[in-house]
């Protein structure tokens, strides 16, 4: 769920995810739309389809609640849980890694991006 | 190979707590990813999931029961334990332990069942 | 919480004859598991991850299905296939089973 994923991107990334990427750009945080602003966003972006597709397999992606481990700078998702439990965190691992990979493109002028300024087709999943 | 066995009290009556063992070999619960379910049938009926302890001690419950279940075990001794407190009638049952082993959603191994009775 | 409703709850079938076991869920589930018991013993595992049989089990066995509806099959039926046999999801927490489908031989 929510606090699982916080608690990941925290720990991989380093950065605060309230105060980082809740939101940033057209897709970090709720919803989303229009073209990404960069490949932070891009990230934002792919998790949203991740979770989209969980959804169509009937998973509660917001209250599922599942294991993993993180060590030396790795994240292990638990083999415990539910099918839905374990996709949801493999969702989430991927989007922290995704948001580490680009810490150094990050754009601080992209933080509470003002929505209605997200244009373009919106890329399908 | 893998067994498991249950044992149990037989009978017991209404409101008392309701203490089940499950003795297993072939397998360590000390073994990363391991674990063992209890799930009960009652007499003619269908199949119902109690609970679930896992290698490392974390423990999962049936919702509809959890604040009468608790789950535990002894790694050293290859055992599993489930209390059920203030049983009633509706607890009586064939009770199994159930083997989950690795990223297994289902349960590949099964005890024979020890059968409680609960008396009025 | 994931219900899961067989049918038929009871059967019969002739030797030889084709036999379908429906198992309905009542939202999307990834696998479905079947197990297969017979009276006085313990279930066993029948068939994982929708169609794979488990060790043992016959040929004229089959799984199928996806989304919210799966079903356990037997080409030809024979006498010791007379059982009951449960459906099981462990797709969202916590896992559950069916009522079970009571198959006879006639």
């Known amino acids: 769920g929510i606090l699982n994923l916080n608690k990941m991107v925290k720990q991989v990334t380093g950065k605060m995810p309230i105060l980082s990427y809740w939101p940033y750009g057209c897709h970090c945080g709720l919803g989303g739309r229009g073209q990404p602003k960069d490949a932070t966003d891009w990230c934002c972006q792919t998790h949203d389809c991740c979770y989209d597709h969980l959804k169509t397999q009937g998973c509660s992606i917001y209250k599922d609640y599942y294991r993993y481990n993180f060590s030396q700078g790795n994240i292990h998702c638990s083999d415990k849980g539910s099918w839905c439990e374990q996709q949801l965190c493999a969702c989430d691992k991927e989007v922290a890694f995704c948001l580490k990979r680009n810490l150094d493109t990050y754009q601080k002028r992209l933080r509470f991006y003002w929505r209605p300024h997200c244009r373009g087709q919106t890329p399908g999943c | 190979q893998v067994t498991l066995k249950e044992s149990g009290p037989g009978i017991l009556q209404s409101s008392q707590t309701l203490s089940l063992t499950c003795s297993f070999s072939g397998f360590s619960l000390s073994t990363s990813s391991m674990g063992v379910s209890w799930i009960r049938q009652p007499s003619g009926k269908g199949l119902e999931w109690l609970a679930h302890?896992?290698?490392?001690?974390?423990?999962r419950y049936n919702p509809s029961l959890k604040s009468r279940l608790t789950i535990s075990k002894d790694t050293s001794r290859n055992q599993v334990f489930l209390k059920i407190s203030n049983v009633d009638t509706a607890d009586a049952a064939t009770y199994y332990c159930a083997r989950r082993a690795g990223n297994f959603f289902y349960f590949d191994v099964w005890g024979t069942g020890t059968t409680v009775t609960v008396s009025s | 919480q994931i219900v899961l409703t067989q049918s038929p709850a009871i059967m019969s079938a002739s030797p030889g004859e084709k036999v379908t076991i429906s198992c309905s869920a009542s939202s999307s589930v990834s696998y479905m598991y079947w197990y297969q018991q017979k009276p006085g013993s313990s279930p066993k595992p029948w068939i994982y991850?929708?169609?794979n049989l488990a060790s043992g089990v016959p040929a004229r066995f089959s799984g199928s299905g996806s989304g919210t509806s799966y079903s356990l099959t037997i080409s030809s039926m024979e006498a010791e296939d007379a059982a009951t046999y449960y459906c099981?999801?462990?797709?969202?927490?916590?896992?559950?089973f069916g009522g079970g489908t009571k198959l006879e031989i006639k």
């Open positions: 302890i896992y290698w490392d001690d974390d423990k």
């Open positions: 099981q999801q462990y797709h969202t927490y916590p896992p559950t």
């Open positions: 991850r929708t169609s």
